[in-house]
């Protein structure tokens, strides 16, 4: 645990039982600001969750307290370390002087909290425009005016060939200083990030001679998702969706190569369906075939009624928030015309089901069928765009007979899903269920899928 | 018929607590939700917070939250409203409204609203 | 939270006369709008559910119709029972709004 940090049991000797955080409320974490405003928005970054908790019964409650006096409850809240937690708090409308963050969690760990005023407070019309200032080791001679005003740019004349150098930027505001930023190495003479020469040797992917990100070739030289760069200096181009499927894109672009297939496997499109809620505003059977290039899965979706319903299927007869009361589950059936042996079910989004209100992330359960109507449960597993499609593997017990799968059903709980398509990936010219069949004297054979009677030459 | 009969009229004090009663009569209580909306004099009408009257899970708006708590008795086909920290602002018309069934819902919308109750707050 | 816009704020008819009220919605809705009409020192009506579906006893002469972010509520003959506020509603999402109301008088 960081001293930067707080964590309940961070002021415990680690040889002693952490206190106990008990329900219901558990412990609290009091911030104050200094400037008491109207938010519109709080932003929390937690560096530690207990995996008994994952995201989401960590934070049971904030309270955000007012100068009227009131404690504006936010309720439970889902957090995660990789990205910090902002809720927007659009309809507070009065000034919070602090907060309150409780927790079930005693290990949990909160490394910061930030209250953003709306725009036009009072507060911010004295601000002053940031400053900035380099720092190098070895130290840059005294009369160089390394703080930058309004221009951007430092030019270092005070070098010696071969030399090592290292630079920082520090952040002035007002008398206020920042941490300096995360160093840049430099050796005088030899290449650096942002020189249009691509050096392998320190990492470089590509280098179009700007530190800017998101023009394909990012800040510290690296190739960006989607992007394929050519040449010196880097030429980047945004290849995803641009019609042509290139080699190097074959697993990546469903829109321009269509569904990636590794070798040695078959992928078989849904061939019908059936869904627990539908009407003529979002029948089941768009699912059924190869979904859409064209779509692309989005996140934080309220209102899926525009222009979805024609490529993936979503449970538009039920709102949003009466699933959430009535605790509502959705299924849907995917059939398939060749019952295989399966090695994978895939499930392609268009929408994750995550609501901009939390950051819960929203699961599906997912069960195959064999021919004999019998279930097989492939477990729990999280929708994100950031992993779309999603591909579950299935793991077969071998003390168990292979099983032919002949549809899947896949179950959730939030009417802001939208499936575009399922797969079931088998295995291509191999089928252990016909292999296991196999008598005496006889030999799977792949072309033929079937068991062939063999003769050994002496 | 489907009725929803309110409790009478209330005058509270700022800082008081009121609780408003909503009974059912003619249908499955425990089918269905259970909405409450204020309207104050001249205002549009506010909606609070709503019950699934079977599970007893509720929903509350964030202006509200803190503030409201509703409730429900499922032996008594009552729901309850009950609002804490009264302040001047409060003073309006609350009414319980029947929403759709936590079934099968064949309908959606406020089907069925009690009478209404008015509360005052004043010093 | 989405804000509910309801235009005009008030309508002069007269009997027999056609209605139209519009409702919009600060961002889009689905399907998920509800019509009611309030009289004075009454409960407020349903009339319409889910965009356009009309509510068991409630006269064919109200319809709805719209999606997205428009809708609209329509009175096609205005009859003397007609006269008083109407209010539309959202569902979509929490917490449920409703717009500030449409008073229809006697011209």
């Known amino acids: 645990s960081s001293v930067r940090t707080w964590s309940p049991n961070s002021a415990v000797n680690p040889h002693t039982v952490p206190p106990a955080c008990p329900e219901p409320q558990g412990c609290y974490l009091e911030l104050e600001f200094l400037y008491p405003l109207v938010p519109e928005s709080l932003t929390i970054w937690v560096t530690f969750v207990s995996t008994d908790w994952d995201s989401s019964g960590a934070v049971n409650d904030i309270k955000l307290l007012a100068v009227s006096g009131k404690n504006i409850s936010l309720g439970p809240q889902n957090v995660f370390c990789d990205v910090p937690l902002t809720i927007r708090l659009w309809d507070v409308g009065e000034e919070v002087y602090g907060i309150q963050i409780y927790t079930l969690d005693e290990h949990l760990e909160i490394d910061a909290a930030m209250l953003t005023s709306t725009a036009d407070t009072p507060l911010c019309l004295q601000c002053k425009p940031l400053k900035y200032k380099v720092v190098r080791d070895p130290p840059l001679q005294m009369d160089v005016a390394s703080i930058l005003h309004l221009n951007r740019k430092f030019v270092d004349m005070d070098l010696n060939l071969g030399s090592v150098y290292q630079y920082w930027v520090i952040t002035i505001s007002g008398t206020e200083e920042s941490e300096p930023s995360p160093a840049v190495t430099y050796i005088h003479g030899s290449g650096y990030c942002g020189d249009g020469i691509i050096q392998k040797d320190q990492g470089e992917q590509c280098d179009d001679m700007n530190k800017i990100n998101g023009d394909g070739c990012s800040l510290f030289c690296r190739q960006e998702v989607s992007f394929n760069c050519i040449d010196e200096p880097s030429r980047c181009y945004f290849h995803d969706g641009d019609g042509v499927c290139e080699e190097f894109e074959q697993k990546t672009s469903i829109k321009d190569c269509g569904v990636y297939t590794p070798q040695g496997f078959l992928d078989q499109w849904a061939s019908n369906a059936s869904v627990s809620h539908q009407d003529q505003q979002c029948p089941g059977w768009v699912i059924i075939g190869q979904p859409a290039a064209s779509q692309v899965c989005r996140t934080k979706v309220i209102d899926l009624s525009e222009g979805i319903s024609q490529h993936a299927w979503y449970p538009c007869t039920i709102s949003y928030p009466y699933s959430q009361l009535a605790q509502t589950t959705f299924w849907l059936r995917a059939y398939f015309s060749q019952p295989m042996v399966a090695a994978a079910v895939i499930v392609h989004l268009v929408t994750d089901g995550t609501y901009y209100g939390d950051q819960k992330q929203e699961t599906i359960s997912v069960q195959l069928l064999d021919t004999k109507d019998q279930s097989h449960d492939l477990g729990l597993h999280v929708l994100s765009c950031r992993n779309n499609p999603l591909i579950i593997p299935v793991v077969h017990d071998l003390s168990q007979p292979f099983y032919h799968s002949q549809a899947v059903r896949v179950s959730f709980s939030s009417p802001l899903v939208a499936i575009s398509g399922v797969a079931l990936r088998s295995f291509d010219n191999f089928d252990p269920v016909t292999l296991s069949s196999c008598q005496r004297g006889e030999t799977y054979s792949p072309a033929e899928q079937s068991c062939v009677h063999f003769a050994c030459e002496k | 018929q489907v009725q929803l009969v309110q409790s009478g009229a209330e005058v509270k004090k700022p800082g008081a607590s009121v609780k408003v009663s909503c009974k059912a009569s003619?249908?499955?209580?425990?089918?269905?939700?259970m909405h409450w909306v204020r309207q104050a004099p001249g205002q549009r009408l506010e909606w609070m917070g709503w019950?699934?009257?079977?599970?007893?899970?509720?929903k509350y708006a964030r202006k509200f939250q803190g503030r409201v708590t509703i409730t429900r008795d499922t032996s008594a086909s009552t729901a309850y409203m009950e609002l804490s920290s009264l302040r001047s602002e409060d003073t309006a018309v609350y009414y319980c409204?029947?929403?759709?069934?936590?079934?099968?819902?064949?309908?959606?919308?406020?089907?069925?609203w009690g009478q209404g109750t008015t509360v005052t707050v004043s010093s | 939270d989405i804000q509910m816009t309801q235009s005009p704020s008030s309508v002069s008819a007269s009997v027999g006369d056609r209605v139209t009220i519009t409702c919009r919605a600060s961002?889009?809705?689905?399907?998920?709008l509800a019509w009611y009409q309030q009289k004075p020192g009454k409960a407020p009506k349903l009339l319409i559910y889910?965009?356009?579906s009309l509510q068991l006893g409630v006269p064919s002469r109200f319809s709805g119709s719209g999606s997205g972010t428009d809708f609209t509520l329509t009175i096609s003959s205005l009859q003397p029972e007609d006269f008083a506020t109407y209010y539309c509603?959202?569902?979509?999402?929490?917490?449920?709004?409703f717009g500030g109301g449409t008073k229809v008088e006697i011209k």
């Open positions: 019950i699934n009257a079977g599970t007893g899970a509720t």
């Open positions: 409204a029947r929403g759709p069934s936590m079934e099968t819902p064949t309908t959606y919308g406020m089907e069925v």
């Open positions: 889910s965009t356009s």
């Open positions: 003619g249908y499955t209580f425990t089918s269905y939700a």
């Open positions: 509603q959202q569902e979509n999402d929490y917490p449920f709004t």
């Open positions: 961002q889009g809705i689905s399907r998920w």
